[in-house]
Amino acid sequence: FGISGRHSITVTTVASAGNIGEDGILSCTFEPDIKLSDIVIQWLKEGVLGLVHEFKEGKDELSEQDEMFRGRTAVFADQVIVGNASLRLKNVQLTDAGTYKCYIITSKGKGNANLEYKTGAFSMPEVNV
């Protein structure tokens, strides 16, 4: 991925919360590229040694993934081309809470954005009619 220019691209994240034991979504969007093979997505968690997830050249690249996330992450591969870099996190744990970075490289340039992810036992509010 030596093709990326020196320009910045816009990356947008949204703070979110995950229910322990359920699946969660870490939301991230970016300026799309016309070639999937030119897009690199890296998810990092502050303080964690390995990567949370990496997607490059049209597929997952998980050789550098931290073991705390092994088997628990996925991007929406068919939506990457339209600028969706959101991460699905399976079986959310209390220790998944923290600051995450969505880092994007495309032929247009690079960009990143952070998001705060909270975890807990959240319940849907009851509606009494």
Epitope: F1, L44, V48, K110, N112
Partner: antibody
Amino acid sequence: EVQLLESGGGLVKPGGSLRLSCAASGFTFSSYAMHWVRQAPGKGLEWVAVISYDGSNKYYADSVKGRFTISRDDSKNTLYLQMNSLKTEDTAVYYCARHGWDAFDIWGQGTLVTVSS
Amino acid sequence: DIQMTQSPSSLSASVGDRVTITCRASQDISNRLNWYQQKPGKAPKLLIYLASSLQGGVPSRFSGSGSGTDFTLTISSLQPEDFATYYCQQAISFPLTFGGGTKVEIK
């Protein structure tokens, strides 16, 4: 203020032992992997060891493997480096550093370890 | 182990100069490259992480570029406080390794 403060350095004879401490403040210590990095007098930086945020993974430089042990006590917000079988070539300033975004983002001021007979 | 080679090992420059330091990895390290500044008697300070991301509080005259094996740290207009030693560091595999350093001196 985010801060790391090393202590425990000093003069020790070859073959001796020393335990370094690094007191952390101003951040959630238990959420971060932590490193030790050293610098021999007039030389460059050398990574020594790392411990993951939960203490489950530890990695060492070949030069210290089997002699040094990294550990942490999250209840005390403190990182440790137990150094045994010290050699003259272990003489250096030892820094503790926080693992941020894939990098050493916060460093302590360093503590000098001198190994000499 | 991944070897990191910095060049030059030292350079002389004047205030206002554009300064470029290069770092080469012995194998592909993607964008997992960091740059640090160290002044005599002080701890190192993180400048750039992930090859090109500027650490908070670091002046915008510092920039990083590159991927794979070849990386560059650029100081667009050297300031008096920038005279120091600069180190690159790979973060892709253990043992983590540093370049030998580049000392930036006053001409």
